[in-house]
Interface confidence: medium
């Protein structure tokens, strides 16, 4: 599908710059750059700058761009499950009297048998089979923390439903904690959501494995359908590779800008709107680090060469097992700009403008 | 960087199949397929099948693979902000007496001035400047729903911090509702999280723009730092294009498998482990829809041709303004498998094995 040539870096940069010229106009749905005839003299109004800065501020709790997947995520995960401790265990006696909560306890020795080392755990899900539900119910999941205290983990709004449905809560961090330093028995609490001004909430949802009284007594369990932890982990015998083998590199600006990597990597490209595009109409910013992806992603013929060295290359050069792997952007970031339409300043956000990392895909 | 050739579809498929052979072994860190000498006869044990099925079950509330971005997301968004109504407004008088909550109201006429149609709104964030915090605080955000009732929206665990920090809550759905059918003034409540068994929580976090009494009375407001809604929307004059122009296609199985698309698209490929790879060692599944991406992503020279027709092509063929756009997987899904190591059955999950959609990147 493609033939190798010596790469003309200048041509690549020119093509990237010209593509960006079209991309920006296209994103703004402009057939040509806007006229600057009516733009008022002087600096941008303070309110416009404040607005522009708001779009640039990172805010607490904002989800950053997806991180490149760590090496461990490429490899297969062994799946096991650990069922909830049956409720004749004395641990449940302490937690019987609540109408707003049910309790689920797990034996940490069973967890450690499945996942001997916390670092091997890739994902843990608490799976509950909720029975049909006639009203909307807002529930919260807590983790048993110290003797009798509970730490909030997450919440879910359960829609009314006419049939049973599996619920899944990601509890990876909690199970990793338990594997490190957990007691003999650890647990979760599923509670009705109570707000500070309405506190008479009852847990309406029925979870398979509990009586409708919701007092923690285990009813008949249909097959394996009582609450369980679904664990995905790197098997112990496969773990030493992760430490010993060279880690899969994140092909990001940190690595690529400071290396002489010939293969797929993010390459530095700063675009100055005035100098590179001949544009004066974008008032802020003056330019930006657009960057681009470049470098080969060799196809690996595994047919006659199934030995460790070749297989190890898949992770870096062709993780998606493509017929023609290609070096493309992985993490992208938006670019806010300020420009004028007539006399009116506008702040606009352009999506996916800055290349932060690349991958072979 | 690449030269055009007639595509040999059979060669592409063969290369994809061979790449998958190496990929699976590589993900399992196997140098060659495992020996089947000790595998017990008969069907798989029921517990193993149940475990395998658990990994295949879609569960309620599980986040599906990221959807391909809708056409509207490609285009620029105009950014505006609407400040919270000042607290001498009578609406605040109804909500003064709580130590666990603060209230923030917004004028819907100002929102409608910024975003005339709900469909134009792409994102709305409630931005709050939280001051330095000395204790961890778990807060909840509510939306004013009917006369005096509040609907839970989201929560955040605020870590202690040595300096002020912007908080952002995604309230796109709520603001879209308000634009459709909101009253004259609508609002949010930020509350301490109260669990059903400990209800004496006080809102410890100070939000800039409120007195320390935290009773909703507005103190002096430092600059523009009182709570505001940051809105990102498609400008009205740009909106008709979205209805009239052909929507950006999702290059997914729904579209690609039922069309004769020559350009970049996901192509159907079922891999039968026995027939295609000569493998008997994977017991479940018998095969899977691996699929692959194929088709040109034409580079568009915009230099001499900045007119609407050419610019419209960017969205489909080169949205990332690449120097050499390439057809690559967008949404991928995992594959669980069951195989034996000696006499022991194993369930393993292989990440990113099934191609659901493609994109030019």
């Amino acid at each position: 599908l493609s033939t190798c040539k010596t790469i003309d870096m200048e041509l690549v940069k020119r093509k990237r710059i010209e593509a960006i010229r079209g991309q920006i106009l296209s994103k703004l749905r402009l057939a040509s750059p806007p006229s600057q005839g009516e733009v008022p003299p002087g600096p941008l109004p303070e309110a416009v700058l404040a607005l522009y800065n708001s779009t640039r501020d990172r805010v607490a709790g904002e989800s950053a761009e997806p991180e490149p997947e760590p090496e461990a995520d490429y490899y297969a995960k062994e799946v096991t499950r650990v069922l909830m401790v049956e409720t004749h265990n004395e641990i449940y006696d302490k937690f019987k009297q609540s109408t707003h909560s049910i309790y689920m306890f797990f034996n940490t020795s069973e967890l450690r048998e499945a996942v001997p080392e916390p670092v091997l755990l890739s994902r843990a899900e608490l799976r509950l089979l909720r029975l049909k539900l006639k009203v909307e119910q807002h529930v919260e999941l807590y983790q048993k923390y110290s003797n009798n205290s509970w730490r909030y983990l997450s919440n879910r709004l359960l829609a009314p439903s006419d049939s049973p449905e599996w619920l899944s809560f990601d509890v990876t961090g909690v199970v990793r904690q338990w594997l490190s330093r957990g007691g003999e028995i650890e647990g979760f609490r599923l509670s009705a959501h109570c707000s500070c001004d309405s506190r008479d909430n009852t847990l309406q949802v029925d979870i398979n494995g509990f009586t409708t009284g919701r007092r923690g007594d285990l009813a008949t369990i249909h097959g394996m359908n009582r609450p369980f932890l679904l664990l995905m982990a790197t098997p112990l015998e496969r773990a030493q590779h992760l430490q010993s083998s060279r880690h899969r590199r994140a092909l990001d600006t940190n690595y690529c800008f400071s290396s002489t990597e010939k293969n797929c990597c993010v390459r530095q490209l700063y675009i100055d709107f005035r100098k590179d595009l001949g544009w004066k109409w974008i008032h802020e910013p003056k330019g930006y680090h657009a960057n681009f992806c470049l470098g080969p992603c060799p196809y690996i013929w595994s047919l006659d060469t199934q030995y460790s060295k070749v297989l190890a290359l898949y992770n870096q050069h062709n993780p998606g097992a493509s017929a023609a792997p290609c070096c493309v952007p992985q993490a992208l970031e938006p670019l806010p700009i300020v420009y004028y339409v007539g006399r009116k300043p506008k702040v606009e956000q352009l999506s996916n403008m800055i290349v932060r990392s690349c991958k072979c895909s | 960087l690449s030269t055009c050739k007639t595509i040999d579809m059979e060669l592409v498929k063969r290369k994809r199949i061979e790449a998958i052979r190496g990929q699976i072994l590589s993900k399992l860190r196997l140098a060659s397929p495992p020996s089947q000498g000790e595998v017990p006869p008969g069907p798989l044990p029921e517990a193993v099948l149940a475990l395998y099925n658990s990994t295949r079950d879609r569960v309620a509330g599980e986040s599906a693979e990221p959807e391909p971005e809708p056409e509207a997301d490609y285009y620029a968004k105009e950014v505006t902000r609407v400040l919270m109504v000042e607290t001498h407004n009578e609406i605040y008088d109804k909500f003064k007496q709580s130590t666990h909550s603060i209230y923030m109201f917004f004028n819907t006429s100002e929102l409608r001035e910024a975003v005339p149609e709900p469909v134009l709104l792409s994102r709305a964030e409630l931005r709050l400047l939280r001051l330095k915090l000395k204790v961890e605080q778990h807060v909840e955000l509510y939306q004013k729903y009917s006369n005096n009732s509040w609907r839970y929206l989201s929560n955040r665990l605020l870590a202690p911090s040595d300096s002020p920090e912007w908080l952002s809550f995604d309230v796109t759905g709520v603001v879209r509702q308000w634009l459709s059918r909101g009253g004259e003034i609508e609002g949010f409540r930020l509350s301490a999280h109260c669990s059903c068994d400990s209800r004496d929580n006080t809102l410890q976090v100070d939000i800039n723009g409120f007195t320390t009494g935290r009773r909703g009375d507005l103190a002096t407001i430092h600059g523009m730092n009182r709570p505001f809604l940051l809105l990102m929307a498609t400008p009205l004059e740009r909106a008709q294009h979205l209805q009239s122009s052909r929507h950006r296609r999702a290059l997914d199985t729904n579209y690609c498998f039922s069309s004769t698309e020559k350009n970049c698209c996901v192509r159907q490929l079922y891999i039968d482990f026995r027939k295609d790879l000569g493998w008997k060692w994977i017991h479940e599944p018998k095969g899977y829809h691996a699929n692959f991406c194929l088709g040109p992503c034409p580079y568009i020279w915009s230099l001499d041709t900045q007119y609407s027709k050419v610019l419209a092509l960017y969205n489909q063929h080169n949205p990332g303004a690449s120097a050499a756009p390439c057809c690559v997987p967008q949404a991928l899904e995992p594959l669980p498998i069951v195989y034996y190591v000696g006499r022991k059955p194993k369930v393993e999950q292989l990440s990113n094995m099934i191609v659901r959609s493609c994109k030019c990147s």
Epitope: - | L131, K132, L133, D206, R214, A219, H222
Partner: antibody
């Protein structure tokens, strides 16, 4: 109440740990600070330890001081004292939940550290 | 940085008079400010916090006001016992801060 101890005459470069012992309240509910005052000078903030254990320091500290705590004590370690560190060192407790701000309403009497060769 | 500048450095006031001490922040700190009184040989004593809230057991002759960057401590009906050094303290940010306290104002009674 809070009381500082451990102040003494030390030579430059000799590490020194001051201890603040608290009674009548739990350190898991209150932020605690260390402040020093050179003879005839004003109050100089060193750092604070929050109830949850987070520590924050003045810009100039630059690793020269470390604050830590146990269930009943808050320690200030001076890693390599210089003559400029000669001062009375105060430990103080935050007002607690009566304000979300960190202000100090219970102070120890102070302990004198003299650094001299 | 959030630097606190106190003025004047010292002031003399007659018994029964009123004294005003100012504290200026280099950037806006909202109302996150406290005032302390310190007498020779003693630790500081909290007078006012959150710019205007009187601490427990403090005389109502002490009044705090201001927000943003300008703050004032006013002592009315001055008594001999008010002779001391007064410090302001910001609690807006610890980041890039050299000192959360102002330089102090010495009040002497005529």
């Amino acid at each position: 109440s809070v009381e500082e101890s451990g102040g003494r005459l030390v030579t430059p470069g000799t590490p020194l740990t001051l201890t603040c012992t608290v009674s009548g309240f739990s350190l898991s509910n209150y932020a605690m600070t260390w402040v020093r005052q050179a003879p005839g000078k004003g109050l100089e903030w060193i750092g604070v330890i929050y109830a949850g254990g987070n520590t924050y320091y003045a810009n100039w500290v630059n690793g020269r001081f470390t604050i830590s705590k146990t269930s009943t004590t808050v320690d200030l370690k001076i890693t390599s004292p210089t003559t400029e560190d000669t001062a009375t060192y105060f430990c103080a407790r935050d007002v607690g939940s009566s304000s979300s701000g960190v202000y100090f309403n219970i102070w120890g009497p102070g302990t004198l550290v003299t650094v001299s060769s | 940085a959030y630097d606190m500048t106190q003025t004047p450095a010292s002031v003399e006031v007659a018994v029964g008079g009123t004294v005003t001490i100012k504290c200026q922040a280099s950037q806006s700190i909202g109302s996150r400010l406290a005032w302390y009184q310190q007498k020779p040989g003693q630790p500081p004593k909290l007078l006012i916090y959150d710019a205007s809230t009187l601490a427990s057991g403090v005389s109502s002759r002490f009044k705090g006001s201001g927000s943003g960057t300008e703050f004032t401590l006013t002592i009315s009906g001055v008594e001999c016992a008010d002779a001391a050094t007064y410090y302001c303290q910001q609690d807006y940010s610890y980041r890039h801060v050299d000192n959360i306290f102002g330089g102090g104002t010495k009040v002497e009674i005529k």
